[in-house]
C-alpha cells in the first residue's frame, strides 16, 4: 500500500532572466527512492538516479543544474517556461509518486513564490 | 553527423594499463555524457561506466572501480579510459557510447578498440 | 546487481517471418529498457529505448513492449539485413546490465 505524500513548491513564480529551484519531498513512507524525474509537461528536463547519478537532457544542459538534493535548478527562465513540472519519485516497494509543481515566469519584478502545498 | 572515433588496437601485457581514446564530432560534446563497454569474445556486453563531459563526475560499475578511470579533454572532445592492472580476461572490444537525450541508454557507439592482454 | 535474461538464445527465421525476443529482468525497472542490434564485427546499433519508443531511423517493422520485468521485441516482416544478435539492457541502476543476446539467423 502507498503511504507516502510528495510536498512540494507548490505555485510559484520568478522573474524573466532569473533562475527558481523546484523542490519535492517525499514523506510519510520508509520506501526507497531509487529515481526522480523532472518533466515539464511532456518533455523529460532531468532524471536523478540513486545509483547513476544524474542525467540532464541535452536540450536544458545549458540552463538546467541539478540540485539542491533531488531538486532541479532553472536558469535564464523565459516566459516559454511557464508551465506545469512534474516530479516523478520512482521508489521500492511503494512503486510511483508524482508532485506537481506550477511555475509563473513574469515580465516584471512583481514575482513572488507561493505557499507550499501538499498532494496525495 | 554524430562520429565517435576510437584509438586503434592494443596488445598488453598482464599487470600493464592501456588507455584508449574516443573523439567525438557532430554535436556539442560537453552536452552527452558518455559511457564505456567492453565485449570479450563471444559474451555479453558489459558496462563500465560514465561520465559527464561538462563536470567530469563519474560513476563506474562497482566491477571495475578499482582499475578504471574515465576522464575527458573538452577542449578536443575526446573521452578516455583507462584500466591498469589487465589480466587476460580483460581481452575484449572496449566501446564509448554516447548517452542518449532521455536516460542511460546509449544512443551512438564508437567502432570498438580491440585491446589483447597476453604475455 | 539487476540480473538479465534473454528467450530464445538463438532462433532461425525466414525473410518475412515475424520474430519476438523475450527480455526478462530479476526486478522491477519500470520502462526504462532498450534494445539494441549488433551484426558481427561491429558496434551495437539503438533500436529501442524506454522499453517502446523507436530510436531515429529505425524501420517500423521493429516495436518493443513491456514493463517492470518482462519485454518483448518484435520483427513484425523479418528482412535480410535483421539477420543479427539482439540485446536487451536496463538502464534504471548501476550497473546497467545487458541481456545474453538472442542470435537470429537464416532457415
Known amino acids: 500500500m502507498m503511504t507516502g505524500t510528495i510536498e512540494t513548491t507548490g505555485n510559484i513564480s520568478a522573474e524573466k532572466g532569473g533562475s527558481i529551484i523546484l523542490q519535492c519531498h517525499l514523506s510519510s513512507t520508509t520506501a526507497q527512492v531509487t529515481q526522480v524525474n523532472w518533466e515539464q509537461q511532456d518533455q523529460l528536463l532531468a532524471i536523478c538516479n540513486a545509483d547513476l547519478g544524474w542525467h540532464i537532457s541535452p536540450s536544458f544542459k545549458d540552463r538546467v543544474a541539478p540540485g539542491p538534493g533531488l531538486g532541479l535548478t532553472l536558469q535564464s527562465l523565459t516566459v516559454n517556461d511557464t508551465g506545469e513540472y512534474f516530479c516523478i519519485y520512482h521508489t521500492y516497494p511503494d512503486g510511483t509518486y508524482t508532485g506537481r509543481i506550477f511555475l509563473e515566469v513574469l515580465e516584471s519584478s512583481v514575482a513572488e513564490h507561493g505557499a507550499r502545498f501538499q498532494i496525495p | 553527423e554524430v562520429q565517435l572515433v576510437q584509438s586503434g588496437a592494443e596488445v598488453k601485457k598482464p599487470g600493464a594499463s592501456v588507455k584508449v581514446s574516443c573523439k567525438a564530432s557532430?554535436?556539442?560534446?560537453?552536452?552527452?555524457?558518455m559511457h564505456w563497454v567492453r565485449q570479450a569474445p563471444g559474451q555479453r556486453l558489459e558496462w563500465m561506466g560514465r561520465i559527464d563531459p561538462d563536470s567530469g563526475g563519474s560513476k563506474y560499475n562497482e566491477k571495475f572501480k578499482s582499475r578504471v578511470t574515465i576522464t575527458v579533454d573538452k577542449s578536443a572532445s575526446t573521452a578516455y579510459m583507462e584500466l591498469s592492472s589487465l589480466r587476460s580476461e580483460d581481452t575484449a572490444v572496449y566501446y564509448c557510447?554516447?548517452?542518449?537525450?532521455?536516460?542511460?541508454?546509449?544512443?551512438?557507439w564508437g567502432q570498438g578498440t580491440t585491446v589483447t592482454v597476453s604475455s | 546487481d539487476i540480473q538479465m535474461t534473454q528467450s530464445p538464445s538463438s532462433l532461425s527465421a525466414s525473410v518475412g517471418d515475424r520474430v519476438t525476443i523475450t527480455c526478462r529482468v530479476s526486478e522491477n525497472i519500470y520502462s526504462y529498457l532498450a534494445w539494441y542490434q549488433q551484426k558481427p564485427g561491429k558496434s551495437p546499433k539503438l533500436l529501442v529505448y524506454?522499453?517502446?519508443t523507436l530510436a531515429e531511423g529505425v524501420p517500423s517493422r521493429f516495436s518493443g513492449s513491456g514493463s517492470g520485468t518482462d519485454f518483448t521485441l518484435t520483427i513484425s516482416s523479418l528482412q535480410p539485413e535483421d539477420f543479427a544478435t539482439y540485446y536487451c539492457?536496463?538502464?534504471?541502476?548501476?550497473?546497467?546490465?545487458f541481456g545474453p543476446g538472442t542470435k537470429v539467423d537464416i532457415k
Open positions: 524506454n522499453a517502446k
Open positions: 539492457q536496463h538502464h534504471y541502476g548501476n550497473p546497467l546490465t
Open positions: 557532430g554535436y556539442t560534446f560537453t552536452n552527452y555524457y
Open positions: 557510447a554516447r548517452e542518449g537525450h532521455y536516460g542511460f541508454y546509449s544512443d551512438y
